[in-house]
């Protein structure tokens, strides 16, 4: 598993560097998670042909993965910092159950899957410090999450592989959009 942000050898070699600003820390954290997703996608793509599959729509119907929309205020047109921040945090909290699903889906990258899950928690905490209106954030209902997880785990092997691929792809896209938006804040 890659080394978490702030713990790489360069940090040890340069102890007199300025501490990271909150924005820099968030940026670094997202890039770290994206690196982890790349490693997981590599294993998924090596294991099955999902990455070239055109049958994604079949599995996508089952999933309600968070996506950025115009109304979320994260795109350049109609950008709204607070609305966007609420969307990013809400989306990450919604992704948590899907990251839980990923935990038993990897053989050689088991640690990496756990690192992505834990690093996402850290990212949520960083972002919460930045948000002004936590009351606008709706957390996922655990009962709904439990039935979703049960449903995903009961799928046949092909659908589970497709679900894994779709979660990783959607999470990557969501984080990339978040990164672009956060760089405007």
């Amino acid at each position: 598993a890659p080394v978490p942000p702030g713990e790489d050898s360069k940090d040890v070699a340069a102890p007199h560097r300025q501490p990271l600003t909150s924005s820099e820390r968030i940026d670094k954290q997202i890039r770290y998670i994206l690196d982890g997703i790349s490693a997981l996608r590599k294993e998924t793509c090596n294991k099955s042909n999902m990455c070239e599959s055109s049958k994604e729509a079949l599995a996508e119907n089952n999933l309600n993965l968070p996506k950025m929309a115009e109304k979320d205020g994260c795109f350049q047109s109609g950008f709204n910092e607070e609305t966007c921040l609420v969307k990013i945090i809400t989306g990450l909290l919604e992704f948590e159950v899907y990251l839980e699903y990923l935990q038993n889906r990897f053989e050689s990258s088991e640690e990496q899957a756990r690192a992505v899950q834990m690093s996402t928690k850290v990212l949520i905490q960083f972002l919460q410090k930045k948000a002004k209106n936590l009351d606008a954030i709706t957390t996922p209902d655990p009962t709904t999450n439990a039935s979703l997880l049960t449903k995903l785990q009961a799928q046949n092997q092909w659908l589970q592989d497709m679900t894994t691929h779709l979660i990783l792809r959607s999470f990557k896209e969501f984080l990339q959009s978040s990164l672009r938006a956060l760089r405007q804040m």
Epitope: E100, Q128, I137, P142, A146, L149
Partner: nanobody
Framework: QVQLVESGGGLVQAGGSLRLSCAAS????????MGWFRQPPGKVREFVGR???????NYADSVKGRFTISRDNNNNTVYLQMNRLKPEDTAVYYC????????????WGQGTQVTVSS
């Protein structure tokens, strides 16, 4: 499995306040979400509010602005502060814990009775 024990219930007049506590014991207490529910007499159990692992709180519309959930991680306790109580808040109040993001509420307390008289 986490054991949850509620306390702080009782009889209070309309407009008054009560603070319920939910103390957890058992394995390491760092649940994904802690929730409060209530069951009014002759009705089904309903959601009151929840606090997730990162401290974000959500409430049922019927209690918004009157009830506040907080937690003390050092004492493994979650609280429900109830202000401006109404007779329709009369119920048995339960706390519940969801240990992981996909586990649902997998631990429940026995409940504590709250009666609001008019």
């Amino acid at each position: 499995q986490v054991q949850l024990v509620e306390s702080g219930g009782g009889l209070v007049q309309a407009g008054g306040s009560l603070r319920l506590s939910c103390a957890a014991s058992g394995r390491t207490f760092s649940p994904y979400t802690m929730g409060w529910f209530r069951q009014p007499p002759g009705k089904v159990r309903e959601f009151v509010g929840r606090i997730n692992w990162s401290g974000i709180r959500n409430y049922a519309d019927s209690v918004k602005g009157r009830f506040t959930i907080s937690r003390d991680n050092n004492n493994n306790t979650v609280y429900l502060q109830m202000n401006r109580l109404k007779p329709e808040d009369t119920a048995v109040y339960y706390c519940a814990a969801a240990s992981q993001s996909g586990s649902g509420y997998d631990s429940w307390g026995q409940g504590t009775q709250v009666t609001v008289s008019s």
